[in-house]
């Protein structure tokens, strides 16, 4: 089948006194392969502080997968969802603390 | 963990089609991949397939594919299986069990719900 | 379609005995992604399974420690290195990395 991009959402929700869960979707994207990994001023961050979801169909012919970390409230602008798929990559902020969902269709 | 209640027990002739339910509370339904399996008495599981409940997505089991399908009602937070042509082979007890895509646990049926026994006869 | 072949059919012991479950598939299991589903579960007499062992070796949580899995390939494993009573019933092994997903057929665990 031909590529399909995927659409990039980064929600934000309360994870412990002083700290956010942070996660980084990537839905409907064909074909399977794609990097999504969490960056701090633009340098990713170690593999074991990130929590990654499984690469799995999502009945529709595409694929989906997530990442996640914790960070510290008032620090999210220093923070980005890297995406790269087929050759096109792109990066996403994690959205302010009053709107929590950001869709971004990556093309 | 949340419940996942399933529909009573249906008694229905041969030939005849039958609506099950589940229904779930205590978690995010959307973030789901709701799976149903079939059992006979004293006989191990067979999968009949999946659907995800944040897109209405599916996959089946080939074998299934002319008898069950998968439908979703995200404002109730209920998925269902509408079995149709029923002949006595069809006689099992009936569960459904999820995925949470977003958890901790890469288990595709982490929780269940408690079965419902469809008998068919005439 | 992944044939799974669980050994043996009945696998009687006395209560503190190590017991050990063999899960055999007719093919690699190691999904696109990477990962091996390969998943293992218990069921009671009138009860739906639980939940044991997921991706070959990683228990669910409140799975008891004395529960562990292995294997890689197509041979996989299970261990229960003390039974208990409450760890009496069927066990199933489960493929989910292939459509159509597969169990074995149980191996029954029960008083000697």
């Known amino acids: 089948g031909s590529t399909v991009p995927p659409m990039v959402n980064v929600t934000r929700s309360e994870a412990s006194e002083g700290n956010i869960t942070v996660t980084c979707r990537a839905s409907g994207f064909y074909p399977w392969n794609i990097t999504l990994s969490w960056r701090q001023d633009g340098v990713s961050l170690s593999h074991d502080t990130q929590q990654w979801g499984d690469v799995l169909p999502d009945g529709n012919g595409t694929y989906q997968t997530w990442v996640a970390t914790r960070i510290c409230q008032g620090e999210e602008q220093r923070f980005t969802c890297y995406m790269e798929h087929s050759g096109n990559h792109s990066t996403h902020p994690v959205p302010s603390g009053n709107s929590h969902h950001h869709h971004h269709h990556h093309h | 963990q949340g419940q996942m209640q399933q529909s009573g027990a249906e008694l229905v002739k041969p030939g005849a089609s039958v609506k099950l339910s589940c229904k779930t509370s205590?978690?995010?339904?959307?973030?789901?991949?709701i799976s149903w399996l079939k059992q006979k008495p004293g006989q191990s599981l067979e999968w009949i397939a999946w659907?995800?409940?944040?897109?209405?997505?599916?996959s089946y089991n080939q074998k299934f594919t002319a008898k069950a399908q998968l439908t979703v009602d995200t404002s109730s937070s209920t998925a269902y299986m509408q079995f149709s042509s029923l002949t006595t082979e069809d006689s099992a007890i009936y569960y459904c069990?999820?995925?949470?895509?977003?958890?901790?646990?890469?288990?595709?049926?982490?929780?269940w719900g408690q079965g419902t026994l469809v008998t068919v006869s005439a | 379609d992944v044939l799974m072949t669980q050994t043996p059919l009945s696998l009687p012991v006395s209560l503190g005995d190590q017991a050990s479950l063999s899960c055999r598939s007719s093919?690699?299991?190691?999904?696109?992604?990477?990962?091996?589903?390969l998943e293992w579960y218990l069921q009671k007499p009138g009860q739906s399974p639980k939940l044991l062992i997921y991706?070959?070796?990683n228990r669910f949580s409140g799975v008891p420690d004395r529960f562990s899995g292995s294997g890689s390939g197509t041979d996989f494993t299970l261990k229960i290195s003390r039974v208990e009573a409450e760890d009496l019933g069927v066990y199933y092994c489960?493929?989910?990395?292939?459509?159509?997903?597969?169990f074995g057929g149980g191996t029954k665990v029960e008083i000697k």
């Open positions: 069990a999820r995925h949470d895509y977003y958890g901790t646990s890469g288990a595709w049926f982490a929780y």
């Open positions: 205590g978690f995010t339904f959307s973030d789901n991949y």
């Open positions: 659907i995800y409940a944040g897109t209405g997505g599916t």
């Open positions: 093919q690699n299991i190691v999904h696109i992604n990477g990962n091996t589903y």
């Open positions: 991706k070959v070796s």
């Open positions: 489960f493929q989910g990395s292939h459509v159509p997903w597969t």
